[in-house]
């Protein structure tokens, strides 16, 4: 799965920044806007009475540059540098008239078929659970196996370093082929199969990856927003997993929601399955001590734990994964389209 080159993006922020650097006015405005904030977080209107005139003017001068509307890609090289530029420029779009954050990631739909070889699975017992089978599929793939071992190593042991573990998790879900990553994490289990459920819940090594004491969810979001990558992943998730109705219709495609969900794993906002017996997911945080922001905190928490779009997307992907092993495929090697599960 080659990393997308900048040229494959319609308007990469890295390209746009280079173009801006060649223009003294644009370059100076970009630097000035960058100095208008010491952290990545955009204050909410309630926190700041107004934006200083110089920042507004610098933003105004950037509004007709190619930087406005530039985007990044989740698998591109120099992704963090691209996201840094995106969020600096985002201030130019939102200063003065606060706008909700927009995902920095350009949608690129791939129709490249991923080949999976099921023939080697016959070494497993026929009644092995599907999580075991998907784990084996990963093991049989050199890249998936290498990446999984890397995070397994980083996330194991009594003295694991959480930040190293998270970095390796992030790398896995970024670089492993999507069907492998999704198969590993979103494998279906029989309702009474606690062993399978336990295996699924432990996929992301929660003992190391998740905080030992659940922090406040709003504090967790604040921490996330101070990092351009985490902020980007969270905004991407909120963009694509936004439920349109209680039936689980997503704002965009279910597959896009799942990609965004998996993109959070390895960030400060790493979600996980809450138990061995169902497919409910949640953030590892609490809304205790939120004071007058209790409602806002519960909305954030609920975006994970009570989100019909996400719930239905996970359920649909698990149904799809079940079908892979229940059908009589004509050949041991079959192709799974990456966009198979879009609605």
């Amino acid at each position: 799965d080659p990393l997308p080159t900048e040229s494959r993006l319609m308007n990469s922020c890295l390209q746009a920044r280079r173009k801006c650097q060649a223009d003294p006015t644009c370059s100076a405005a970009y630097h000035h806007l960058d100095s208008c904030t010491s952290s990545i977080s955009t204050p909410l209107p309630s926190e700041e009475p107004s934006v200083p005139a110089d920042c507004l003017e610098a933003a105004q001068q950037l509004r007709n540059s190619s930087l406005i509307g530039c985007m990044c890609h989740r698998r591109m090289k120099n992704q963090v540098a691209c996201l840094d530029i995106y969020w600096t420029v985002h201030r130019a779009r939102s200063l003065g008239n606060y706008e909700l954050d927009v995902s920095p990631y350009e949608d690129t739909v791939t129709s490249k078929p991923w080949k999976m070889n099921l023939s080697k699975l016959n070494m497993l017992k026929p009644d092995s659970d599907l999580c075991l089978k998907f784990a084996m599929l990963c093991t049989l793939n050199d890249k998936c196996d290498r990446l999984r071992k890397a995070y397994g190593e980083a996330c194991s042991g009594p003295h694991c370093q959480r930040h190293v573990c998270l970095r390796q998790l992030l790398t896995f879900f970024e670089k492993a082929a999507e069907p492998h990553a999704q198969g590993l994490l979103l494998c279906p289990c029989a309702p009474n199969d606690r062993g399978c459920g336990e295996r699924r819940r432990n996929t992301i090594a929660p003992n190391c990856a998740l905080p030992p004491v659940a922090p406040n969810c709003l504090e967790l979001r604040r921490l996330c927003f101070s990092d351009p990558l985490c902020r980007s992943r969270l905004v991407d998730f909120q963009t694509h997993c936004h439920p349109m109705d209680i039936l689980g219709t997503c704002a965009t495609e279910q597959s896009r929601c799942l990609r965004a969900y998996l993109g959070l794993i390895g960030t400060a906002m790493t979600p996980n399955f809450v138990s061995n017996v169902n497919t409910s997911v949640a953030l590892s945080c609490t809304c205790r001590g939120s004071g007058n922001l209790q409602e806002e905190c519960e909305m954030l928490e609920g975006f994970f734990s009570h989100n019909p779009c996400l719930t239905e997307a996970i359920a649909a992907k698990m149904r799809f994964h079940s079908q892979l092993f229940s059908q009589d495929w004509p050949h041991p090697t079959f192709a799974v389209m990456a966009h198979q599960n879009e609605n």
Epitope: P24, A28, H32, C36, T37, E48, P49, A53, E57, A58
Partner: antibody, heavy 120, light 113 residues
Framework: EVQLLESGGGLVQSGGSLRLSCAAS????????MSWVRQAPGKGLEWVSF????????YYADSVKGRFTISRDNSKNTLYLQMNSLRVEDTAVFYC?????????????WGQGTLVTVSS | DIVMTQSPDSLAVSLGERATINCKSS????????????LTWYQQKPGQPPKLLIY???TRESGVPDRFSGSGSGTDFTLTISSLQAEDVAVYYC?????????FGLGTKVEIK
């Protein structure tokens, strides 16, 4: 060395017009915002108008809005202030001032000023 | 508009003594996102244009003697001349540049006692 030299001031009757100029040298004129600031005799400083380096953004004090127009000619390194419908209370020394950046912050260089006197 | 209030109106200080000028803004000029105070101080001697002394509330302009210092945050600011010299006789103005229009205080006249 940065230099700003105002000209165009003088005595004018109420309701009349004047055009002030400010010749700039010693810096990349088109990269910096410029402002006009005035000072009535024996009084404090009052900001009048702002223009960005490209001329794309202009702002005015409420007291002069609709009567004064700020402009610049970057090829001539010159800042202008066209003043129409002048009033007695516009009597002041008018300074052109260079912005430290290009965004309307503080003024790091000032001209010597040109006196505008509006008589009734 | 942000109103800038300077005190005192005038100040007589002996040579070598400390002079302190206060400036208060009607609303905060501290921008929490970059932790900068949008306040500057100018010195104006008779018959001359203003000269920049201090910006961002406490950063001294190059070439300005280190006896001049600025302090304060939010709405309350101070310009201090640690040891007054004869050439410091002038009117001192504070200015906010947080919002348009930028506004000046009415000035504080510093004289020698």
């Amino acid at each position: 060395e940065v230099q700003l030299l105002e000209s165009g001031g003088g005595l004018v009757q109420s309701g009349g017009s004047l055009r002030l100029s400010c010749a700039a040298s010693g810096f990349s004129f088109n990269n910096y915002a410029m402002s006009w600031v005035r000072q009535a005799p024996g009084k404090g400083l009052e900001w009048v108008s702002f223009i960005s380096g490209s001329g794309g953004s202009t702002y005015y004090a409420d007291s002069v809005k609709g009567r004064f127009t700020i402009s610049r000619d970057n090829s001539k390194n010159t800042l202008y202030l066209q003043m129409n419908s002048l009033r007695v209370e516009d009597t002041a020394v008018f300074y052109c001032a260079k912005d430290r950046y290009n965004y309307g912050t503080f003024f790091d260089y000032w001209g010597q000023g040109t006196l505008v006197t509006v008589s009734s | 508009d942000i109103v800038m209030t300077q005190s005192p109106d005038s100040l007589a200080v002996s040579l070598g003594e400390r002079a302190t000028i206060n400036c208060k803004s009607s609303q905060s000029v501290l921008y929490s996102s970059n932790n900068k105070n949008y306040l500057t101080w100018y010195q104006q001697k008779p018959g001359q244009p203003p000269k920049l002394l201090i910006y961002w509330a406490s950063t001294r302009e190059s070439g300005v003697p280190d006896r001049f210092s600025g302090s304060g945050s939010g709405t309350d600011f101070t310009l201090t001349i640690s040891s007054l010299q004869a050439e410091d006789v002038a009117v001192y103005y504070c200015q906010q540049y947080y919002s348009t229009p930028p506004t000046f205080g009415l000035g504080t006249k510093v004289e020698i006692k």
